[in-house]
Amino acid sequence: DAHKSEVAHRFKDLGEENFKALVLIAFAQYLQQCPFEDHVKLVNEVTEFAKTCVADESAENCDKSLHTLFGDKLCTVATLRETYGEMADCCAKQEPERNECFLQHKDDNPNLPRLVRPEVDVMCTAFHDNEETFLKKYLYEIARRHPYFYAPELLFFAKRYKAAFTECCQAADKAACLLPKLDELRDEGKASSAKQRLKCASLQKFGERAFKAWAVARLSQRFPKAEFAEVSKLVTDLTKVHTECCHGDLLECADDRADLAKYICENQDSISSKLKECCEKPLLEKSHCIAEVENDEMPADLPSLAADFVESKDVCKNYAEAKDVFLGMFLYEYARRHPDYSVVLLLRLAKTYETTLEKCCAAADPHECYAKVFDEFKPLVEEPQNLIKQNCELFEQLGEYKFQNALLVRYTKKVPQVSTPTLVEVSRNLGKVGSKCCKHPEAKRMPCAEDYLSVVLNQLCVLHEKTPVSDRVTKCCTESLVNRRPCFSALEVDETYVPKEFNAETFTFHADICTLSEKERQIKKQTALVELVKHKPKATKEQLKAVMDDFAAFVEKCCKADDKETCFAEEGKKLVAASQAALGL
């Protein structure tokens, strides 16, 4: 439906508050280094312009595309060249190339200071003094650090952020009320950002077909009672929403997401019995709730898949007539029967089925050729089952911190060229799979674990893409989206790696470690562990464990000492010498 003025259309659909918030997110995700005040000024200018277009859609420039309007506005920033270097060259381009250029310069790991949480009283004062600025600042700080954050979902986070301050700044014990809520929002926010980053990577690196296949599998698991045509419609709409958000079209994305939530709620009866509660909520909560809704129960007495996809004499005819539709039906039918499988496993099965049909439908006796195709699925199903069993046993034996350490060693030996901060971050996140998924019964373990690992390995892939250092990481990240995890699982110790020179400074610790939070202290120790493996990649698990145990005892001892700094200096020298001897450094 064509509108004379796209900016007026979106302003009216979304309302001023959401319009301003989404434009701020869009600008902060593009120009990640710009100061808050500069962004607010740009947003206010765009908003004032939008209002003139609402008043008169024929007014000057109101017919321009959003990309043109927003891009022109971003290109007015005076310090673009000094702050962003070659990104300033984007401004010499015309749309749509200019927007593509901005997208390519989004930085997954921007050089920004860590967000330090002020004292509760300081935050509450700031909240009361200027609530609007306080909440805008939240949107700005999250958006610039997470340039692919799902914008309509960030509005939902901001709403919860506001509610936390509204409630807790009036509480008797403000800190006890507020801090757990902020911790929860931070952790959920990081998870939400990583999940969305995988969706954008799927679309941008592997194309719409890959994303649609993922969506068919996931929605079929979630809505097993829905017809294939219904699932297909939802997949088409969902793909449009995510394509827009990943492409920086945040106003269209938020608008279309609201329309999709409305459609789902109006058609609950033909989609899922689990949507009732979600659909009673306000818009932002409703959309979030639908996205997280539990799988509906499978219809009773679903027939065997073999009849339509192996035994039927029309398999090759049906496949040839509409390949992607037929494969989509296969994926839908398989996924709705298997909520116990990960999405990536379902996609591997569909790929195996497709490969078999491609080969067999050109053979002399197609049916004879593809008759045993389902037998090929067995090892594909058993592979993640076995690995999850092994890793959950290891997690239960070690606990989260030591399980993370085992993964740190595993991945550092496989890809030692990757930067230490990236190895620590990724391995810590991989290790969280234990607490997140191993508690589940067998039927929920695989979808929990393997789909979570896909999200975390994508973090490794996007961070590595910024500064590529390892051909093996590039290969695992680019060859196949659904086989990234098996590719990393199969990697060997990198025999070509030349061990890092020993640097005593890397293993020198000071009394400041004693005042760190438990998490920060773990990160310090895990950083040392990675460095240790980089120095001695052939060290055995037993050797590394012994050194790490000594190291933990050393930190504990010196943090209890009266003269901590002297203890760290003297005992540290002894520990380094002993570790060198133990590892033959």
Epitope: P379, L380, E382, E383, N386, L387, Q390, N391, A406, R410, K413, K414, N483, P486, C487, F488, S489, A490, L491, E492, V493, K541
Partner: nanobody, 117 residues
Amino acid sequence: QVQLVESGGGLVQAGGSLRLSCAASGRTPYVMGWFRQAPGNEREFVASISWTYGYTNYANSVKGRFRISKDNAKNTVLLQMNSLKPEDTAVYYCAARRGEDPEYDYWGQGTQVTVSS
């Protein structure tokens, strides 16, 4: 447990070819590989293949000359060695690992490969 039995070693002229075979019984391994050890040297990695997906890894020294493959039906891994050089002379060991850690849990007895110049 995984039991591994190698075969196919022998004496060959430089530039010639050999095919090593390793039969696995017991549990299905996750990855199977070949290592080699020449007299006075450390054991070194040669090649590996993941059982389910067929992902392969090769040492730089054998890339383009050696090819690892598997026969799932026979639970066997093959190492086709072409353009052999005297420096390929070693005892070749088949090995298996049961999981993602790049350390091998099970080892065969080894088979001697001698390349004469």
